[in-house]
Interface confidence: medium
């Protein structure tokens, strides 16, 4: 969903996380059990460099289950 070099920062990052994770909520840093690069948070990964939808979704809370 991103072009090369595009980044998400500040309010746009929060806005987009609220949208992508709308059914779950989100974290600014991944829970340690799910972290691949534990020293990094979403700001570093998506604002300081470009990130993609798959990476954004790793910051969503536990996936929702339908009833």
């Amino acid at each position: 969903a991103y072009g090369p070099g595009e980044t998400l920062c500040g309010g746009e990052l929060v806005d987009t996380l609220q949208f992508v994770c709308s059914d779950r909520g989100f974290y600014f840093s991944r829970p340690s059990s799910r972290a691949n690069r534990r020293s990094r948070g979403i700001v570093e990964e998506c604002c300081f460099r470009s990130c993609d939808l798959a990476l954004l979704e790793t910051y969503c809370a536990t996936p929702a289950k339908s009833e």
Partner: antibody, heavy 115, light 105 residues
């Protein structure tokens, strides 16, 4: 006051293309994410696509992924939806809606896909 | 996939109170804000309630929203003929199936 005006709908054959526009006024356009939401005749609302306020992120419903492209021109206060490879099931009224809460909607533009 | 379930239809007489439910799983309705939209016949949807219970300016206080557990509800008191419409709940990009409100008489 906030106003969203869609245009570009019409009759198109299956496999064809259309480009919808949504002209915005009455608010700070570049501060709001925007979405397209559609409603098939006699049916409920279905979110189609989203674009963040600077255009850095775009998202799509599975039903249109790979066929539709959302974009925005922040110098013209205009939102677009390029629709390719149209199918009969894409027939609907298409609305543009503001923000993540969809707090304002346009009047809609009808897209009919039929041979 | 997330599913938000609404009754297809509800009805009430003028002046009565009606409620419309929106049911989902604890991980969506229980965690996230629910919004409600009103769609009068032949018109575009309009935001009626946002963030579970907040009313945008211009929406009468006859309309109220609440959330408890895995359900959200829209209540309309002092029902009027002009309230006859379709009502949708949503969690951002996911909409319920809609409820048609009929005002009797």
């Amino acid at each position: 006051q906030v106003e969203l005006v869609e245009s570009g709908g019409g009759l198109v054959q299956p496999g064809g293309s259309l480009r919808l526009s949504c002209a915005a006024s009455g608010f700070t356009w570049s501060s709001f994410a925007m979405s397209w939401v559609r409603q098939a005749p006699g049916k409920g609302l279905e979110w189609v696509s989203y674009i963040s306020y600077l255009g850095s992120y775009t998202g799509y419903a599975d039903s249109v992924k790979g066929r539709f492209t959302i974009s925005r021109d922040n110098s013209k206060n205009t939102l677009y939806l390029q629709m390719n490879s149209l199918r009969a099931e894409d027939t609907a009224v298409y609305y543009c809606a503001r923000g993540t809460k969809f707090d304002y909607w346009g009047q809609g533009t009808l897209v009919t896909v039929s041979s | 996939d997330i599913v938000l379930t609404q009754p297809p239809s509800v009805s009430g007489a003028p002046g009565q109170r009606v409620t419309i439910s929106c049911t989902g799983s604890s991980s969506n309705i229980g965690t996230y804000d629910v919004h409600w939209y009103q769609q009068l016949p032949g018109t575009a949807p309009k935001l009626l309630i946002y963030s579970n219970s907040k009313r945008p300016s211009g929406v009468p206080d006859r309309f109220s929203g609440s959330k408890s557990g895995t359900s959200a509800s829209l209540a309309i008191t002092g029902l009027q003929s002009e309230d006859e419409a379709d009502y949708y709940c949503s969690i951002t990009r996911v909409f319920g199936g809609g409820t048609k409100l009929t005002v009797l008489g």
